[in-house]
């Protein structure tokens, strides 16, 4: 007797797993920036503190009733999908609420960031278990909405953030697009994106995953017994901030970096139509639906790895994007891709002692993204080994020197605009293990990282066809680190990580007459850990 | 996930008559003004102003005063709502958007924000 | 497997007492609300009593305040229903029932009670 | 205390034909109503929670709408395991009351 939503994000074999004390209560406490809440709901009684805090504007119309039912509707709701009894994620959950949304849903920004403040405030004058704090609300982008959500991040804080229900990139709204949240878009029954009238959620790259957010079951403010079910991007993020209430609740250490890394490694992977989003943003959008993690003590140990995609270059000239990972992560290869094709490749770079993974645009280019690898790798230790463009001669290869060091990933870069040279920098597995291999007037960047036990081995997939796009999988056990295209007779635009696949994109010249020699190649640097063993390239 | 999203931002600067009134603020703002994108969410008229990282809690509050002081030569009433340093250092607002520039050139103001509406999802 | 399970009812005096217990097992007991209904022969249903989880809270039938206690024990996993003053217009079937949003999603199969001189 | 009127205490049908039967609260009940199905020497079985939402393995043919006071319990095609007493209850506020019951038989 399961409603949907909980039965998706709860593997079957999870639900009678005891997530929370033998007392039934739980050591996270979750913050929810809401509408007021009946606290007296069955749901939720006993589970639920009203703060003292309330920063919302006025009503607008002179003629607003304020029914305490409906200024409670959305709050009332959220508590208990988080907490609830019957119908929440994270049954033993304390939740504190603070009202930063009127009767008719809406606050201001300054609101919300008095309200970020208070939580901090608390936290220093109280300090206590891990905090989650869930934000089911948007607004456009500011920027200060967001470095608030950055250092209240920086303080262990886990914030879960709404995408947005305005079928539009959650890169515009705020707090969607802070870094440090994380952001949630909605799905249906069938995970499919939800449709809200004429909008839906939101989508983009800075949607982290999506949770069920369509006729969701919860406690209704119109009596203590009363249920109804609501829609939206606020009931998506509550799922996964009920999630992140149990997996701290089991594992109260995890960071944010691992709780994010988590929840996407074990999330439902490909089950989304990806053609309800509009065409630019389907290679931005996350394909994956929240489910509880196992615990860490069944899976601790392996190499995290996420895609964290820059925002696009702009056409001009000069333009760079930039993609960064979180502090904790590490940056294990860095590539781009352009729809256009003219790009003059990528590299890793020092910005304010953070490696960055920067894409470069090329003169006629309608712009690139930056695609950064960042992982989470104890003890890991990276540096880059550059060389410079070739001006003739062979072609010059990239390896890692330094002692117990393997390669993880592969950039390159032209500094001249020929869309002939970028016959891409080579990797070869057959014949030059554990090699970055450059064309002339190629700049080749090999990242090399050292950590107890790494070891990594290349992947290569060939298509001599005409095709689009050649894809190449790590098998089980083994993490994609690394991506890049090795272009056969067309043009390449360039590759990415989605999950654990490289993806190779090309303009297809309709030859298909190809020889194997031509053919375009996935190329993927596969890595595990295994910390008993020593760092080791793998031949194949 | 965002460097600066779908923003407007604004480089105010005070007619130059009005800088020989102004001691202290007589250099040229480097800070920079921020308003939502969306016409219809703005709120003009409150202001977060944010001031560098490194500000110290005490520079808050003098500079939320200076800016008072500002005003009230010029023959605006300001309104102090509240004082941010738990998260980052900064000041609300309640003020005329006039007064804009002369905000922009205060000592450690890195930008202002024109405050804005937040939705329930 | 969800279940509940009430003890033998039986036939009693007017003006006696009797206690009704309800095992439950299949489920955390301590997560809901538990509930008594009733049903004379042949006649509708009658809801008795409940008890929010810790047994803290309780809500009667008006008619049934002062002369029936619902109570449980959490670390037993077993719900009661202690009826004093028994009348003949109690005799009835009398159904365990647990509560999910706040209606009764699992029944015990009943145990009759018959109040006769 | 809320009175529940359930108006019909026996309809009859067909197999195979689509009935509803009506439910109306002496007061205001917003959407907290259940439906249950009881056959003979059985408990009483949960169909239908908060006005409108399936219990869990309940077919889809079992419907519930409405809210306030006035709500309506639909089969849309009855079979021979449907032929059973129908009550509904309202759990908006303790005591919790029940209709009297419509018992559903074949012409």
């Known amino acids: 007797s399961i409603p949907w939503n909980l039965e998706r994000i709860i593997p079957a074999w999870q639900q009678t797993e005891e997530d929370s004390s033998p007392d039934g209560s739980s050591q996270v406490e979750v913050y929810l920036l809401d509408t007021s809440i009946q606290s007296g709901h069955r749901e939720i009684e006993g589970r639920v503190t009203i703060t003292d805090f309330n920063s919302v504007p006025e009503e607008d119309g002179t003629r607003f009733h304020r029914q305490a039912s409906k200024c409670d509707s959305h709050g009332t709701h959220l508590a208990g999908v988080v907490s609830g009894r019957d119908a929440g994620v994270a049954k033993g959950t304390s939740l504190h609420s603070l009202r930063v949304l009127n009767c008719q849903g809406k606050g201001t920004v300054s609101g919300t960031l008095i309200g970020l403040e208070f939580i901090r405030k608390s936290q220093l004058i109280q300090p206590s278990g891990p905090l989650v704090v869930l934000l089911p609300l948007a607004g456009g982008y500011s920027r200060i909405l967001n470095t608030a959500c950055q250092r209240l991040a920086r303080t262990g804080v886990v914030l879960v953030a709404a995408a947005g229900n305005f079928r539009d990139d959650a890169c515009l709204y705020s707090p969607a697009s802070a870094p440090e949240v994380i952001t949630v878009g909605a799905t249906n029954a069938q995970d499919q994106p939800v449709t809200l009238g004429t909008l839906g959620t939101n989508f983009g790259r800075c949607v982290d995953l999506f949770a069920p957010g369509k006729d969701i079951i919860g406690a209704s403010s119109d009596c203590s017994t009363c249920y109804m079910s609501q829609s939206g991007t606020s009931q998506a993020a509550a799922h996964v901030a009920g999630i992140v209430a149990m997996m701290l609740n089991r594992d109260p250490a995890l960071t944010l970096a691992e709780l994010r890394q988590r929840l996407i490694l074990f999330s439902t992977k490909d089950v989304i139509n990806m053609a309800w989003f509009p065409e630019d943003q389907r290679v931005l959008t996350p394909n994956r639906v929240a489910t509880l993690p196992p615990s860490t003590q069944e899976t601790g140990g392996q190499l995290l790895c996420r895609t964290v995609w820059s925002a696009h270059s702009g056409p001009t000239r000069t333009a760079t994007a930039t993609a960064r990972c979180a502090p904790e992560e590490e940056l294990l290869s860095c590539s781009s891709f352009s729809r256009s094709g003219r790009r003059r490749g990528d590299r890793i770079e020092a910005i304010g002692g953070q490696q960055v993974c920067k894409a470069l645009n090329a003169f006629g280019g309608e712009g690139v993204y930056a695609v950064a690898r960042c992982c989470l790798l104890p003890r890991v230790n990276c540096s880059i080994h550059n060389t410079p463009a070739a001006r003739a001669g062979p072609q010059t290869p990239v390896h890692c020197h330094q002692k117990d060091h393997v390669l993880t990933g592969c950039s390159f870069h032209w500094e001249v605009e020929n869309l002939r040279a970028q016959q891409q920098p080579l990797l070869r597995s057959r014949h030059q293990p554990g090699q970055c291999v450059g064309h002339q007037e190629a700049s080749v960047h090999a990242s090399c990282c050292h950590a107890p036990g790494l070891e990594c081995k290349i992947k290569e997939h060939g298509i001599a066809g005409p095709a689009e796009q050649v894809t190449v999988a790590c098998e089980a056990g083994w993490t994609l680190t690394g991506c890049n295209v090795l272009p056969g007779a067309s043009l390449p635009l360039g590759a990415y990580s989605v999950d654990n696949v490289c993806v190779a994109r090309i303009r297809d010249a309709g030859r298909a007459d190809r020889t194997s020699e031509e053919a375009t190649v996935a190329a993927a640097i596969c890595c595990r850990s295994r910390p008993s063993a020593k760092a080791s390239w793998v031949h194949q | 996930q965002d460097e600066d999203g779908d923003y407007e931002e604004l480089m105010l600067a005070l007619p130059s008559q009005e800088d020989s009134l102004v001691d202290e603020a007589s250099h040229v703002a480097t800070a920079t003004f921020r308003r939502c994108s969306k016409e219809a969410w703005r709120l003009p008229g409150t202001y977060v102003v944010v001031l560098m990282e490194e500000t110290q809690r005490l520079q808050v509050e003098q500079t939320a005063h200076r800016l008072q002081t500002w005003a009230a030569r010029r023959g605006y009433v300001i309104k102090v709502l509240h004082v941010f340093y738990d998260l980052f250092p900064g000041f609300l607002v309640k003020m005329s958007s006039d007064l804009l520039g002369l905000a922009l050139k205060l000592p450690h103001v890195e930008y202002i924000e024109e405050d804005s509406l937040v939705f329930a999802q | 497997e969800v279940k509940l399970v009430e003890s033998e009812g039986g036939l009693v005096q007017p003006g006696s007492s009797m206690k009704l217990s309800c095992t439950a097992s299949?489920?955390?007991?301590?997560?809901?609300?538990m509930a008594w209904v009733r049903q004379v022969p042949e006649k509708g249903l009658e809801w008795v009593a409940n008890i929010n989880y810790d047994g803290s809270n309780t809500s009667y039938l008006d008619s049934l305040k002062s002369r029936f206690i619902i109570s449980r024990d959490n670390a037993k996993n077993i719900l009661y229903l202690q009826m004093s003053s028994l009348k003949s217009e109690d005799t009835a079937t009398y159904y365990c029932a647990r509560e999910k949003f706040a209606a009764m999603d699992y029944w015990g199969q009943g145990t009759s009670v018959t109040v006769s001189s | 205390d809320i009175v529940m009127t359930q108006s019909h205490k026996f309809m009859s049908t067909s197999f195979g034909d689509r009935v509803s039967i009506t439910c109306k609260a002496s007061q205001d009940v917003s959407n907290a109503l259940a439906w249950y199905q009881q056959k003979p020497g059985h408990s009483p079985k949960l169909l239908i929670f908060?006005?409108?939402y399936r219990y869990t393995g309940v077919p889809d043919r079992f419907t519930g709408s409405g809210s306030g006071t006035d709500f309506t319990f639909t089969i849309s095609s009855v079979q021979a395991e449907d032929l059973a007493v129908y009550y509904c209850q309202q759990h908006y506020s303790t005591p919790w009351t029940f209709g009297g019951g419509t018992k559903l038989e074949i012409k």
């Open positions: 908060s006005a409108s």
């Open positions: 299949g489920f955390t007991f301590s997560d809901y609300y």
